[in-house]
Each structure stands twice: as C-alpha cells, then as structure tokens.
C-alpha cells in the first residue's frame, strides 16, 4: 500500500443573477484550504433559466419562482450532497427588478417574497434576495473581472504575496436595462455618489462608478422604436423589408419610455411598423438618448452626469460582448477602431432584411436590433464615455475570463462570503509548521 | 424545381486536395445561399463552411478554417468546395445543400452527396 | 463551443408517438430545424423554425422547442418513419451551423 494524496475540499457557492430579461444560475468553487488565496474561486457550472426575468412576473410572483425550479434542481446534482448545507445561496436582481420597484413596488416585494419562498425550500445556505443598486452592480463587475484576471495580488515565484503592477482594468456592462461603468481614479469624485473606496488585501482602491438605468439594451430598444413612432413612423434602424405588429402597451409599459407615451393611446392597439435600413436616421434617433447640453461638475460623460476621462485598460461584457461579436463574428467585420466599429455598424444598418438573414441564418427576428444595438454601443462608447482612438484601444470585448462569465454575481458573492480579505496576505495570522 | 447536381466521386492521396462542384440545374443562386456538409463513415453530419453567392460572402466552421475554399459561379450556377492537406479522417460524403430564404437560410435541397477517398 | 446533444436511439411502438429530443443551452432563443437521413440518402428537411413542416411533409411531424430542450414528435409512427433524425440549429457566437449528433429512430413491430 501507499499513501495518496487526497484532492482538496471543495466548497461551493450560488449566485442567481436576476437580470432584466432572463436568470441565470452561477455555482462558484475553491479549494476550502486556500478561500483567501486570490484568483482560486472559479466557475463550476451555470444554468440559463427559462422565460423573462423575475420582473416580467409582476403580475404572477408565484411563476417567477416557479422558473428557478430546474435551475435548483440542477444545483442539487452539480454540488456534492455532502456541501449543501455550507454553500451559500443568494439571489441578486438588476435593473429590470429596480425599475419594477419604481413603478410598482408592491410587485417588486411580492416577486421577491415568492422566489424568497422557493428558494428556502431547497438544502442549501440561503442567504437572501435582493434588489442591487447600479453602484452595487457597477463595482461588483469591477471585482469579478479583476480576480479573475489576477490583478489584484498574485503569488510570486519566490514564495510571497504580491501586487501586480499592470494596475487594474476598468469594466462596463451592458445589461438588458441598465449599463455601467466602472474604473481606478486617483483624484477624489466631484460627485461622491459616484465614488466607492474599497480595501482589498490591504491595498486601497478609489473607484468611480455609475450606472445608467433605461440605457440598457432592451430598454434602448424600446425607447428607439417609441422614437420612430413618434418621429417617422418607419424605424430607420431596422432593415427594409422587415416589418413588425408592434402593440402599443409593450412600447409604452416601461418607465424608460414614460417622456415619450402620448398623451391619449390605447394599450392594446396594434401598429404595423416597417424598417428603412437608414444608417444616418438611425444615428440621429441613437444620438437622441443622449443630452450633453448641462453638466454641473468640471466634466460629464452625459445627462449631467460626473465623469473623470476614461483611463487605463477596460473590459466591455454582456450585451457589449454579444454586440462587438456578433458585427466581428456573423458580419465577418472588423472591430479593432473606433472608427471600424462606426462604419460596421453602418454597414449593419445598410442591410435590407433579405441580405441580413442570408447573411446570419436561423434566427428570430432579434436579428432586426443589430443596427440599433450596435449603433448605441458605438454611440455610448465614443460620445457618451469619451473614448477616443487610443483609448479604445485599451478595451477588450470579452464573455469569460479563466472560463467563467464576466459580470457582477462573482464579485457579489467574494464580498458577501469575505472570500476578499482587507488585509494583505502577509498580515494573515497562522501557524508555521515547517 | 430546382436541383442540386454534384460532381463525381474521388479517391486522392493524403497531402493533396480535392475540388467538389455542386451544379444548380432548374434555377439559379439568386437570393439562395450553399452549404457544405460532411458526413464520415457511420458518422453524423458536420458543417464546413457556406456562400452567400448574391452578396459573395463565406463563412467557414472553425475546424476546417484556412483549409477550405468555397466560391461559387454565379453564370454557371455552380458552387465549389476544395479542402486541403487532406488526410484519411477525410474520408467522408460531401453534400452540397441549398440554404432557402423561405426556410430561413436552412437546408431546404440536398444532392447525394460526393464520395471522398482519402488513401496512400 | 455550443453543443446540441441528442440520445442515440429511440424505440417506438408502430402506430404510436415518438419524442427525439435535442438539449442544448438556451435552445429555446435559438431556431431548431430537423432532417431525416435514411440509409443511403441525402438528408431531408422536416421541420424548420422550431415546428413549421416543409410542404410534402407529413402532419404528423410536429416540433416544439423551449428552454433547453427543442423536441421532434412523430405520431402514429410509421414503417417508413425509421431513420437517422439530426436537429440543427445556427450558433451566433461562432457563426456556424451546428448538428446534434443525430438519433436512430426504430419502429418496432
């Protein structure tokens, strides 16, 4: 006989990202003996939850429950039995759930209450559903793509703890109702609501952060076509020989696309509304959502809103990933500029929808938003954020990062579970046995 | 009614190439599009690659990239496929199949296939 | 990469229902288009956008898809019915076309 080495405990931990417009389940792993160590806890599994978000239940909380139901059992097989009780379980919901709470706050706690009942009902360590505010979600992002990419501490070949000195990358997501931008700055914010100070390993982080709620793609979708409604009566961000029955109440539900509603509209009336495939109407429909006539600080991103000049590396995740890929990836269009995003996203917008399918085959009539999304992506980043031609050059459009998904649940869940400590390693007090 | 004609079957030695032709008789390539799917030995069916001939665009599957060519004759209604480096895991049915708007760009006409050999 | 995952085989009853199912993530965003390959032939179209039949094709194909899972459904299975079922679907991120890797259907009696 020998003695073998048994492999590591592992602990396990879930996080349900409740986002505007679908949930998805992340079960997060680590080796129990090395929870501080830094870039340990990886992705061990996910599950896309079937149907809307958690927020399109408002008018049956008990069917947002219910949705969560095959993603739990699945999280019943992926974590070992014998970890159930230990593993932490929290539910964090987005946009989609703050602006619920706006316009509805008793559907809000109903939703809330209902999945807080279905989830306590499973084995595992739940530890709570919560709506997140946009700085919450901001940083979070922040947190996850810089552990995961190890820029925080790394352990050296010589044996000690140390900080990298490539400093730390900027995030933004673009989520289904709202996006965010999050970065390292060294002056203090002119708005403090839009500075967060954070101590991680015993380094100390001044952070700028801010989310812009209704500026998420779904809602940017809508509050375009309540635009060309309004303006044109065709949509010059869809492609020509696309045409749609758009029902008026779907339009004009969201507190995002409150401005425009008329004044009298029936709900459930029925507008046929057809594409024009017009890159330049569809600029100035895009260019319409932002407003850069006041800005109260020393300088503003948009609407009045503090931002100091983008620096340093970014990472761009979520609907900005999908969007880049799917102009880089399906349309076979290069995306390495500014300038090259600009005129794919032209070239996108000056496809008929007979060119657009035979070019990206199978799909559902989302195909049609391309134009639209990747027109405000551009618009976002380069007028709305103030990247010019060098700092985009310093943006990485990314899914994952050391195969787990980029956004706020891993963040959220090292800060809740302390898997971050304040204190730097070296600090630590333990045993030496050598 | 259009169908799909292929070329005829091919035996070649490991290193080299093959060219396979796929012939539209009845029509044209007019807002259609063709795809290449293999299909080795017992087998299931894998994608290579596609041409959108009307708007000379291709896409090939990541597998195969920067070892198939597909291009297309738009005066001849004829569509090609040519692999390279070929070796034995080769060997396989090649079918050209018609990508049909009114399927949404899915395989709505297949030919029988051309049989490739790849053997030393 | 994504992955369309289909069982082997599927036994069924001469006159009665059989159900091939095709999982893959989020499947239910996506289109799934079915072929049917008998031994020897080039594939056939039997359902496209998740549950539309091809005209020539029997009513008694039928497809649904949501969630993971797309399904195809053959009711009151037939003699000729047995063959190779492969679900398809186009994968965004890579730009390709993907297959499942195919069911063998037996109609048994």
């Known amino acids: 006989t020998r003695d073998v080495r048994e492999p590591p405990a592992l602990k396990y931990g879930i996080v349900l990202d409740a986002g505007s417009s679908h949930t998805s389940m992340f079960i997060y792993k680590w080796p129990a003996d090395k929870e501080n160590d830094t870039g340990i806890v990886g992705q061990h599994s996910s599950c896309d939850v079937p149907g809307g978000g958690i927020s399109s239940y408002a008018d049956n909380p008990s069917g947002a429950s219910q949705s969560l139901v095959g993603c739990l059992e699945q999280a019943l097989q992926d974590v070992p039995k014998e970890r159930h009780a230990g593993t932490p379980l929290y539910l964090g919901a987005t946009a989609g759930m703050r602006l619920l709470n706006l316009t509805n706050p008793e559907a809000s706690t109903s939703v809330l209450m209902a999945v807080t009942h279905t989830l306590t009902q499973y084995p595992f360590d739940f530890r709570g559903a919560r709506i997140l505010s946009g700085q919450e979600e901001g940083v979070f992002g922040w947190v996850t793509a810089n552990y995961l990419l190890e820029n925080f501490i790394k352990y050296g070949w010589v044996g000690r703890w140390f900080r990298p000195r490539k400093g730390t990358l900027g995030a933004m997501d673009l989520g289904g109702a709202s996006t965010q931008i999050t970065f390292e700055t060294t002056s203090p914010a002119e708005d403090r609501a839009s500075e967060v100070q954070l101590h991680l390993y015993g380094q100390h982080y001044r952070v700028y952060t801010h989310s812009f709620l209704c500026y998420g793609r779904d809602q940017v979708l809508q509050r375009l076509l309540a635009s060309a409604l309004q303006t044109h009566g065709f949509h010059p961000c869809w492609p020509r020989g696309f045409s749609t029955q758009v029902l008026l109440g779907d339009v004009y539900q969201s507190p995002c696309t409150m401005a425009q509603r008329p004044q009298n509209f029936n709900s459930s009336a029925r507008v046929s509304l057809s594409g024009s495939s017009d890159p330049h109407l569809c600029r100035d429909l895009v260019s319409g959502l932002f407003s850069f006539s006041s800005c109260p600080f020393s300088r503003c991103s948009f609407n009045g809103v503090f931002q100091p000049p983008v620096a340093g590396n970014f990472v761009a995740f979520s609907a900005f990933f999908y969007t880049v890929d799917f102009l880089r990836t399906s349309m076979g269009l290069p995306v390495a500029t500014l300038q090259q995003l600009e005129a794919a996203a032209v070239n996108v917008c000056n496809q008929t929808w007979a060119q657009l399918q035979a070019r990206v085959p199978g799909q559902r009539a989302r195909l049609a938003d391309y134009c639209a999304g990747a027109m405000f992506v551009q618009q976002l980043l380069s007028r709305g954020y103030g990247f010019d031609e060098r700092a985009f050059g310093g943006v990485i459009f990314q899914k994952k990062a050391a195969d787990t998904a980029v956004g706020w649940a891993l963040g959220y869940m090292l800060n809740l579970t302390n898997l971050i400590p304040a204190d730097p390693p070296g600090l630590r007090k333990g045993t030496d046995f050598s | 009614q259009v169908q799909l004609v292929q070329s005829g079957a091919e035996v070649k030695k490991p290193g080299s190439s093959v060219k396979v032709s796929c012939k539209a008789s009845g029509g044209t390539f007019d807002s259609y599009a063709v795809s290449w799917v293999r299909q080795a030995p017992g087998q299931g069916l894998e994608w290579m690659g596609r041409i959108v001939p009307w708007l000379g665009f291709t896409r090939y599957a990541q597998k195969f990239q920067g070892r198939v060519t597909i291009t297309a004759d738009e005066s001849t209604s004829t569509a090609y496929m040519e692999l390279s480096s070929l070796r034995s895991e080769d060997t396989a049915v090649y079918y050209c199949?018609?990508?049909?708007?009114?399927?949404?760009?899915?395989?709505?006409?297949w030919d029988q296939g051309t049989l490739v050999t790849v053997s030393s | 990469s994504y992955e369309l995952t289909q069982p082997l085989s599927v036994s069924v009853a001469l006159g009665q229902t059989a159900r091939i199912t095709c999982s893959g993530d989020?499947?239910?965003?996506?289109?799934v288009y079915w072929y049917q390959q008998k031994p020897g032939q080039a594939p056939v179209l039997v359902i496209y956008d998740d549950n539309n039949r091809p005209s020539g094709i029997p009513e008694r194909f039928s497809g649904s898809n949501s969630g993971n899972t797309a399904t195809l459904t053959i009711s009151r299975a037939q003699a000729g019915d047995e063959a190779d079922y492969y679900c398809a679907s186009y994968d965004l991120q890579q730009a390709r076309w993907v297959f499942g890797g195919g069911t063998k259907l037996t109609v048994l009696g």
């Open positions: 199949a018609r990508e049909s708007p009114g399927y949404r760009y899915s395989f709505d006409v």
């Open positions: 989020a499947i239910g965003e996506k289109y």
